[in-house]
């Protein structure tokens, strides 16, 4: 070894998603999601790992409960910084109904259109975050099949908070949210004990999303 050789400490950067993906996050905004800022903290931690731009990853957000709102489209923002600012400002829309099938179907039919910024030939990813059984679960099977037919990769997250608060069985709920996730389920489905724990899955979720373009 040369006498001039030096050991230099270096820090590996946080893994970033610098690939081309169109990601639509579908958020349950019904009243039972509490506290809401746990959701915005989760969004912040997930989005700051992404390299967002018109030629990189694009992110859109849809919020649903009794009805559906497009918080912002895939092509609305052209940098990670802009998306982070917008995501922080998303307010909970409320409502007692959890129309999960409607939320997913609206994301598929509307959020993933070219008019809203979806790009031809770019992999579509949907992340669904919810805390309760859907009130329109009779539609869920068909809606998921429609996503499958359009090659939309789905990650689903079950928040068990409202079930734990009411000491209710989570079995039926977990099965429903598992059915939303793409195969293999164990790589596309997550569950957290409550809203505060959402941030604990960000790293793994991020890595699995990024792996889609590996």
């Amino acid at each position: 070894v040369s006498p001039t050789f030096q050991v230099v400490n270096s820090i590996a950067p946080v893994q970033e998603c610098s690939t081309q993906l169109d990601i639509v996050i579908v958020l349950d905004g019904s009243n039972s999601i509490y506290p809401w800022d746990s959701v915005t903290a989760f969004l912040n931690d997930l989005l700051e790992r992404m390299d967002i731009g018109p030629k990189q990853t694009q992110v859109g957000i849809v919020q649903y409960g009794e009805n559906v709102t497009h918080e912002f489209n895939l092509n609305k923002y052209s940098s990670t910084e802009e998306v982070l600012v917008a995501a922080k400002k998303i307010v909970q829309r409320g409502g007692r109904q959890t129309m999960t099938a409607l939320g997913i179907d609206t994301a598929r039919k509307e959020a993933f259109t070219e008019a809203r910024g979806a790009r031809r030939g770019v992999k579509k990813v949907m992340v669904i975050v919810t805390d309760g059984e859907s009130h329109d679960n009779h539609r869920l099977k068909k809606v998921i099949q429609d996503c499958e037919d359009e090659n939309i990769q789905r990650f689903s997250i079950a928040i068990l908070g409202s079930y734990n608060r009411g000491n209710l069985s989570t079995e039926k709920f977990v099965e429903e949210i598992k059915s939303i996730a793409s195969e293999p389920t164990e790589k596309h489905f997550f569950n957290v004990s409550d809203e505060l724990a959402l941030v604990t899955i960000v790293k793994t979720l991020g890595e699995r999303i990024f792996a889609l373009e590996a």
Epitope: N31, Y34, W36, R93, G95, R96, S162, G166
Partner: antibody, heavy 124, light 108 residues
């Protein structure tokens, strides 16, 4: 901007009936629970009950069950608190407040993030 | 129902001083579902803190909440003239809402 605007002060005699109101704006009023809170002169805050204007589902504090009626008219984004027969001990400031949280099934939780300006009710 | 006891009843301090307000519950408050409100004379209460330690929108960072189980604290790191008011704690983990009796922070 989220706002809860309450009706004006009332002076009533014992035995009379009364209905006070709380009109919400700046958010989807039918999608959030509205609570009512009493504050007697020089005293602290007491939760009375809560209503979901979307379907008028109502919960009462045991202390106020049967003493008051909480209702809502979702078409005009308004919640109401009413008495059929007022007593001198009903003299107080009454506040409405929006619940950030839920009260579905048997479980209620959440904090009150926006409050009305209060309605002073005097019974004498 | 859960009874909340606030102490002291009155706190006499000067602007710039640190205020520490206590709220003790008669039984454990689930998920740290405890909030703090500020009320000034002839005004409605204003939300300061929820889930024991989260600041509400627009609340200055001199206000902080801590605690879990049965013991909770609201701290005002450096009192400003506008902070002299009555402070209430409130629990909401038992399908009803109960408030403490209040702590008055007055100018010394």
């Amino acid at each position: 901007e989220v706002q809860l605007v309450q009706s004006g002060a009332e002076v009533k005699k014992p035995g009379e009936s009364l209905r006070i109101s709380c009109k919400g704006s700046g958010y989807s009023v039918t999608s959030y629970w509205i609570g009512w809170v009493r504050q007697m002169p020089g005293k602290g805050l007491e939760w009375m009950g809560i209503i979901y204007p979307g379907d008028s589902d109502t919960r009462y504090s045991p202390s106020f069950q049967g003493q008051v009626t909480i209702s809502a008219d979702k078409s005009i984004s308004t919640a109401y608190l009413q008495w059929s027969s007022l007593k001198a001990s009903d003299t107080a400031m009454y506040y409405c407040a929006r619940l950030q949280g839920d009260c579905s099934g048997g479980t209620c939780y959440g904090h009150f993030d926006y409050w009305g300006q209060g309605t002073l009710v005097t019974v004498s | 129902e859960i009874v909340l006891t606030q102490s002291p009843g009155t706190l006499s301090l000067s602007p710039g001083e640190r205020a520490t307000l206590s709220c003790r519950a008669s039984q454990s408050v689930s998920s740290s579902y405890l909030a703090w409100y500020q009320q000034k004379p002839a005004q409605a209460p204003r939300l300061l803190i929820y889930v024991a330690s989260r600041r509400a929108t627009g609340i200055p960072d001199r206000f902080s909440g801590s605690g879990s189980g049965t013991d909770f604290t609201l701290t005002i790191s450096r009192l400003e003239p506008e902070d002299f008011a009555v402070y209430y704690c409130q629990q909401y983990g038992t399908s009803s809402w109960t408030f403490g009796q209040g702590t008055t922070v007055e100018i010394k």
